[in-house]
Interface confidence: low
């Protein structure tokens, strides 16, 4: 993740917004899109949480009326929401490298209110060029949004976008192997608004994520779960209203 | 306040098996780890594993393998751990503690107040 | 496994005292430590985890330090409803693993 990367820089970006061929609706990747190889603030950021507070979860106690980090879920049949257009990601035509995922996508959720935490199956796990996209709605005075791609019990990826940390709005990513977080990785570059309509799109490369909220690019996370083909589950949790949850070969 | 009930004392034959319960309450169950703490004889914490309730994923200490089972029921947000092949040195407290992590956090941030497993013929 | 020492099992100290309890790892644990209240009535309660970091609703009195393989916890004013026993708790690695514990007593 570039520690000098700014959601201006995503935006301008070079004459060539899709230096890779990625659908225009991908979002204004910047030049050199690879070229980032996920800086990170080693030994930085050791958590610094209010005291007594954790960051990413509601502060045992704290928020009268909801309970835990997560203040329920939406019933089904409330909030509806735009539903998912399924076209909106053609495919290239390309068989995928394994063969798991024909081009043929999208898989996943069908469109319309689904419970949170929710938990999208990824059977064959994830490949290159393989696109995941939800769509949903960030609550009134959200606290967190979660995403994390499982193998097992672990963590191969977790997009953890922290409304309030310090008073501050950052997003975080980690790894947890054998129930043990890594070093995380920062981005202070924050697309999302309480209250608001998001697409978050999680496109998988061969050696990394790369994320992209709202058309734009925002940050790449390098692999550090290798065995792709494993990371069989995307839990989506925290406080939004979930209208879909798709993937797609491009 | 997030609350955690465990089901009262319990007195069994050697060799029976004895399964515990934790009620959670005041939080949403499947958004954190539940673990598993033996205090034998009111000394040393040992800690035995963890669940998460959302897909019942589980880890356990080794030492703990094939002696503690853990399941959840998420509709009644009940934590359990079944001891099998009970002998006297399972005699214990044992405790379920909410486990919360994020980042370089990982931490039992609240306890049931503990269940008595006595073990005698 | 990671061992995890607290060499002193019981501590007497009066009332107002500052109160250090200390804990030290096999190998270094980089910080990932906690601390943990046990009432002699057998109630549980975190203190402070990640070796500094006050837990919600824990008296400012109480503050953790330390690094690599040694860590402490430090009450800078004692009270009566600080006796108890005091655990020190690792999750560099699994499984995780508590100190011996540290019982304090009043004069």
């Known amino acids: 993740m570039a520690d000098n990367f700014s959601l201006h820089d995503a935006l301008s970006g070079s004459g060539n917004p899709n230096p890779q061929g990625w659908p225009g609706a991908w979002g204004n990747q910047p030049a050199g899109a690879g070229g980032y190889p996920g800086a990170s603030y080693p030994g930085a950021y050791p958590g610094q949480a209010p005291p007594g507070a954790y960051p990413g979860q509601a502060p045992p106690g704290a928020y009268p009326g909801a309970p835990g980090a997560y203040p329920g879920a939406p019933a089904p049949g409330v909030y509806p929401g735009p539903p998912s257009g399924p076209g909106a990601y053609p495919s290239s035509g390309q068989p995928s490298a394994t063969g798991a995922y024909p081009a043929t996508g999208p898989y996943g959720a069908p469109a319309g209110p689904l419970i949170v935490p929710y938990n999208l199956p990824l059977p064959g796990g994830v490949v290159p060029r393989m696109l995941i996209t939800i769509l949903g709605t960030v609550k009134p005075n959200a606290n967190r949004i979660a995403l994390d791609f499982q193998r097992g019990n672990d963590v191969a990826f977790h997009f953890n976008p922290r409304f309030n940390e310090n008073n501050r709005r950052v997003i975080v990513c980690n790894t947890k192997l054998d129930n043990n977080w890594g070093r995380e990785e920062r981005q202070s570059v924050f697309p999302f608004e309480s209250g608001k309509p998001f697409k978050i799109q999680v496109l998988v490369e061969p050696d990394h994520f790369k994320v992209a909220v709202n058309d734009a690019h925002l940050l790449q996370y390098n692999h550090r779960v290798k065995k792709l083909n494993e990371i069989s589950k995307l839990g989506i949790s925290g406080d939004i209203d979930l209208t879909s949850a798709s993937y797609t070969m491009i | 306040e997030v609350q955690l009930q465990q089901s009262g004392p319990e007195l069994v034959k050697p060799g029976s098996s004895v399964k515990i319960s934790c009620k959670a309450s005041?939080?949403?169950?499947?958004?954190?780890?539940m673990d598993w703490v033996k205090q034998s004889h009111g000394k040393r914490l040992e800690w035995i594993g963890y669940?998460?309730?959302?897909?019942?994923?589980?880890g356990y200490n080794q030492k703990f393998k094939g002696k503690a089972t853990l399941t959840v029921d998420k509709s009644s947000s009940t934590a359990y751990m079944e001891l099998r092949s009970l002998t006297s040195e399972d005699s214990a407290v044992y405790y379920c503690?909410?486990?919360?992590?994020?980042?370089?956090?990982?931490?039992?941030?609240?306890w049931g107040q503990g269940t008595s497993v006595t073990v005698s013929s | 496994d990671i061992q995890m020492t607290q060499t002193t099992s019981s501590l007497s100290a009066s009332l107002g005292d500052r109160v250090t309890i200390s804990c030290s790892a096999s190998?270094?644990?980089?910080?990932?430590l906690n601390w943990y209240q046990q009432k002699p009535d057998g109630t549980v309660k975190l203190l402070i985890y990640?070796?500094?970091s006050l837990h919600s609703g824990v008296p400012s009195r109480f503050s953790g330090s330390g690094s690599g393989t040694d860590y402490s916890l430090t009450i800078s004013n004692l009270e009566p409803e600080d006796i108890a026993t005091y655990y020190c708790q690792q999750y560099s690695k699994l499984p995780r693993t508590f100190g011996g514990g540290t019982k304090l007593e009043i004069n």
């Open positions: 990640y070796t500094s």
């Open positions: 503690a909410r486990s919360y992590y994020d980042g370089s956090y990982d931490a039992m941030d609240y």
């Open positions: 669940i998460y309730p959302n897909n019942g994923g589980t």
């Open positions: 190998q270094g644990i980089s910080n990932y």
């Open positions: 005041r939080y949403t169950f499947t958004d954190y780890n």
